[in-house]
Amino acid sequence: AVNGTSQFTCFYNSRANISCVWSQDGALQDTSCQVHAWPDRRRWNQTCELLPVSQASWACNLILGAPDSQKLTTVDIVTLRVLCREGVRWRVMAIQDFKPFENLRLMAPISLQVVHVETHRCNISWEISQASHYFERHLEFEARTLSPGHTWEEAPLLTLKQKQEWICLETLTPDTQYEFQVRVKPLQGEFTTWSPWSQPLAFRTKPAALGKDT
């Protein structure tokens, strides 16, 4: 038996993946646990095995199909259960009726690249990954630039309130190494949250031309 408080949080990536984290205060040791997905209007069921990510939390990904396949819609409800093995039986540890499009977290943007770089500015583009066509243009982005001698946490956030997969960074210092990250969020969904940050893109501004004011 397991005592203690339990938290079961899942997000849908808008296509074919539901990622879940289950936290449990009471120690579980070597118990085998699963997340079981039971849609209300689909013929499939899906399970994934919870694997430890820390002392008291476990995670797994319900892979519903090929990465870009649209497996759920705005009207779907999926009953999600955490089941843990107790001897030969399975015990329900947590349960939720999950509305996928109310609990969205997209994949991190990919394919970041420098389109054009100058002494004081840099134009960067990216792509979104595995995002549903349902969103059309209803997405927003946050970006941040890491300057020398600073941390990511200190970097100011730049907000793009529309589906704009590029940015022109201004007022940069010549001949300086920077890093850039971006994340995405749909406008839809009461519990929707930001995607993870993209992999950092490193770039260097061009040196100032000799003999000219900068």
Partner: nanobody
Framework: EVQLVESGGGLVQAGGSLRLSCAAS????????MAWFRQAPGKEREFVAS????????DYVDSVKGRFTVSRDNAKNTVYLQMNNLKPEDTAVYYC????????????????WGQGTQVTVSP
């Protein structure tokens, strides 16, 4: 839907070993809990072993515990059944099975099946 092809069967003497392989294609392999079943002549198809999506948790029928080991390589889209200390009663056609639902892997009617590979254990 996933397609399954078994290999590795053959004729072996009692006490010997065989390693069966089941190659999967056509879908995202890590979606599936995988299992091995067997069917001896004139008998029902029976569950032998299963392995979860991550490969971390396995399950066996009592008669093969300690002799058979099920494993999977998600990078190669393949599941294996290592069979040691084989007995004549292990003679059967061995089938690979896949199901996206771990809790239904033992039910014969809900699985996707391979074509089977013959294992014969002589006394």
């Amino acid at each position: 839907e996933v397609q399954l092809v078994e290999s590795g069967g053959g004729l072996v003497q009692a006490g010997g070993s065989l390693r069966l392989s089941c190659a999967a294609s056509g879908d995202v392999f890590v979606r599936y809990t995988m299992a091995w079943f067997r069917q001896a002549p004139g008998k029902e198809r029976e569950f032998v072993a299963s392995v979860t999506d991550s490969g971390r948790t396995t399950d066996y029928v009592d008669s093969v515990k300690g002799r058979f080991t099920v494993s999977r390589d998600n990078a190669k889209n393949t599941v294996y059944l290592q069979m040691n200390n084989l007995k004549p009663e292990d003679t059967a056609v061995y089938y690979c099975a896949a199901n996206t639902d771990y809790f239904q892997i033992k039910s014969l009617d809900r699985n996707t099946w391979g074509q089977g590979t013959q294992v014969t254990v002589s006394p």
